[in-house]
Interface confidence: low
Amino acid sequence: LVPHLGDREKRDSVCPQGKYIHPQNNSICCTKCHKGTYLYNDCPGPGQDTDCRECESGSFTASENHLRHCLSCSKCRKEMGQVEISSCTVDRDTVCGCRKNQYRHYWSENLFQCFNCSLCLNGTVHLSCQEKQNTVCTCHAGFFLRENECVSCSNCKKSLECTKLCLPQIENVKGTEDSGTT
């Protein structure tokens, strides 16, 4: 089966790459606008320039296009702990991220919240904190992992999963983290 193409995609596919079909005259291919600009007026005829205008402050286009309006710049969500990594330019949207020693937890495809990386107190770092993943800790003997924190076995209730981990064990040598590392 041939996949269904939207009207714009059908029209675009008639013209060579970097051009689009004139909406009123399908025998004319107009040159697309560069990133950072938008379509103000279609080209008047074959071989004639498309009228492209630069995006205004607070808007952008990140790729060649024939959009009638630039896209609005994203705003970083302060309530989610986000900070601006780089500001919006005419050809690039705002880049939002987290502070040092924080990671992103995605609530949906486009919405993330910043959380502090776990320090693995009473344990050691197994997997270092990454942009989109918290530190993974390994707990010392006498401690068990609960919500990525090493909690003393004295807080282990019989009904919890920790009972297996908090059985008397051969004493595990507890090292201290080297002061020369972060």
Epitope: T124, S128, F144, T181
Partner: nanobody
């Protein structure tokens, strides 16, 4: 199949240095923290050092702190232990170990390499 192959052991005088290597295969090296443990003649296992998967967190037993340095090269799937200012009490078989990431300390060890510190 997970394989850990240690090398670099040998006879060294007190105060000398050695560098142990551990070539890892059969698993995604960069996803696991790694460590070194040792066993002196007639004694139990002693944990020596551990390093996180990306190498930015290192841990040492008090007995080796300031003298030993653990490091890793994730592009070569290799773990290292640089041992300086060696003492007679460092004489042992040194084992490379792969950590599970769960509570258990480690799930795979190598065959070991013997380090003898003697004049």
């Amino acid at each position: 199949e997970v394989q850990l192959l240690e090398s670099g052991g040998g006879l060294v005088q007190p105060g000398g240095s050695l560098r142990l290597s551990c070539a890892a295969s059969g698993f995604t090296f960069v996803k696991y923290s790694m460590g070194w443990v040792r066993q002196a003649p007639g004694k139990g296992l002693e944990w020596v050092s551990q390093i996180s998967n990306t190498g930015d967190h290192t841990y040492y037993a008090d007995s080796v702190k300031g003298r030993f340095t653990i490091s890793r090269d994730n592009s070569k799937n290799t773990l290292y232990l640089q041992m300086n200012s060696l003492r007679a009490e460092d004489t042992a078989v040194y084992y490379c170990a792969k950590y599970t990431g769960r509570w258990e300390p480690f799930d795979y060890w190598g065959q070991g390499t013997l380090v003898t510190v003697s004049s």
